[in-house]
């Protein structure tokens, strides 16, 4: 047994990013345990991550069922073996997290992009559909399924040897950019999403360059 | 099969001890929670408390505080219940229940047989 | 606590009937429900989780649903093996508590 009284949860941020959504918080645990709930405005409560130590909950699979709506979480503390609480008889006590709308706020992954093609006068470049952990009918979405005309693309591209860049954007998920024949290009794709007023654009792709010669080496 | 067996029947004097066992085989041990759910005679089902096998952590209804401890040997796959200060109204049959993980529904899906536990003078 | 009002407490219906019985929670608790069996002796079994999930090897003449703070459950088509004491339990709110318990019994 002891006498450490409980304490509640604080700094609890959202974590999101795809839709894959974990509620963070503090402290680390001594002598109690945490019970994560999770509702929309107009919503039950539902407990998740039951009496647990960590300090981090997956939330996932109650955001997806709806990844418009606006949630709002709250961390109960409860004291764990003979420990005392410091809630008033009955009141347990827990601390509400900030409200979270997925679709507004998850963060967008870093785009991958899939192929590239150089002919002519035209570079072609085509940024991966990632899925997200949103289903519907059993079958994960993909964020062009869950965001529509929302999601664009944005590309930068410059010739190899050039610092001077140039952006294009797309509402669909490939490219088609003028070029010059016979020169190299190097690019990366941000995906935007056109509606958000924050948090709008996603990280940097991996940046790929075409190979338009080889040195006279052959390497 | 998966299966939870308990120690048997006691009979303790008012103020005592008792400590019930519940081992647990056909299953991994440590990847579910297991509570403490008693029954007076021909009354309904109390849930006592909960404990996590894998850390040890341990969370008790309030009406308990002070007063159980419960316990685990992951060596044994055994989870102990210890009730201390008896009293007529403790006695009971206490049972251990699995029941989900800090993911899954806290529902009971497997059962010890029981053990009464006689509280008299 | 979360208090748990089943009924009613007790009630007989003939084999083939079907048998309602009711869990009103004191407050919401989401579909986190669950629904146990007790014949005498013996400990309980689970029949239904989260509200309206059949247990596996569960028959399918029980059934579970709810509607707001109030959960059914229903065995459609009474069978002298399901006398026993029936019990709802939430786990939404520490602690999990259960229902008193309906006792059915066959005329």
């Known amino acids: 047994s002891g006498t450490t009284n409980t304490v509640a949860a604080y700094n609890l941020t959202w974590k999101s990013t795809n839709f894959k959504t974990i509620l963070e918080w503090e402290p680390k645990p001594v002598n109690q345990v945490y019970t994560v709930q999770i509702s929309t405005k107009s919503g039950d409560w539902k407990s998740k991550c039951f009496y647990t130590t960590d300090t981090e909950c997956d939330l996932t699979d109650e955001i997806v069922k709806d990844v418009k709506q606006t949630y709002l979480a709250r961390v109960f503390s409860y004291p764990a073996g003979n420990v005392e609480s410091t809630g008033s008889a009955g009141e347990p006590l827990y601390e509400n997290s900030p409200e979270f709308t997925p679709y507004l706020e998850t963060n967008i992954g870093q785009p991958v992009i899939q192929k590239y093609e150089q002919g002519g006068t035209k570079l072609k470049v085509t940024v991966k559909d990632s899925f997200t952990l949103v289903r519907k009918n059993g079958t994960f979405l993909t964020l062009r399924q869950v965001f529509g005309n929302d999601l664009g693309y944005i590309l930068t591209y410059r010739k190899d040897s050039s610092t001077g860049r140039k952006t294009n954007t797309t509402h669909t998920n490939e490219f088609l950019i003028d070029v010059e024949k016979g020169v190299s290009y190097c690019f990366f794709a941000q995906a935007v999403i056109f509606s958000r007023k924050t948090n709008h654009k996603s990280p940097e792709s991996i940046t790929k360059c075409t190979e338009q010669w080889k040195s006279v080496l052959g390497e | 099969q998966v299966q939870l067996v308990q120690s048997g029947a006691e009979v303790k004097k008012p103020g005592a001890s008792v400590k019930v066992s519940c081992k647990a085989s056909g299953y991994t041990f440590a990847n579910y929670y297991m509570h403490w759910v008693r029954q007076a005679p021909g009354q309904g089902l109390e849930w006592m408390g909960i404990?996590?096998?894998?850390?040890?952590?341990?969370v008790y209804a309030q009406k308990f505080q002070g007063r159980v401890t419960m316990t685990r040997d992951t060596s044994t796959s055994t989870v102990y219940m210890e009730l201390s200060s008896l009293r007529s109204e403790d006695t009971a049959v206490y049972y251990c229940?699995?029941?989900?993980?800090?993911?899954?529904?806290?529902?009971?899906?497997?059962w010890g047989q029981g053990t009464m536990v006689t509280v008299s003078s | 606590d979360i208090q748990m009002t089943q009924s009613p407490s007790s009630l007989s219906a003939s084999v083939g009937d079907r048998v309602t019985i009711t869990c009103q929670a004191s407050q919401d608790i989401s579909n986190s429900l669950n629904w146990y069996q007790q014949k005498p002796g013996k400990a309980p079994k689970l029949l239904i989780y989260d509200a309206s999930n059949l247990e596996t090897g569960v028959p399918s003449r029980f059934s579970g649903s709810r509607s707001g703070t109030d959960f059914t459950f229903t065995i459609s088509s009474l069978q002298p093996e399901d006398i026993a004491t029936y019990y709802c339990?939430?786990?939404?709110?520490?602690?999990?508590?259960f229902g008193g318990g309906t006792k059915v019994e066959i005329k």
């Open positions: 339990q939430q786990y939404n709110f520490h602690p999990l508590t």
């Open positions: 404990i996590n096998p894998s850390g040890g952590i341990t």
């Open positions: 229940a699995r029941g989900g993980s800090k993911v899954a529904a806290l529902a009971f899906d497997i």
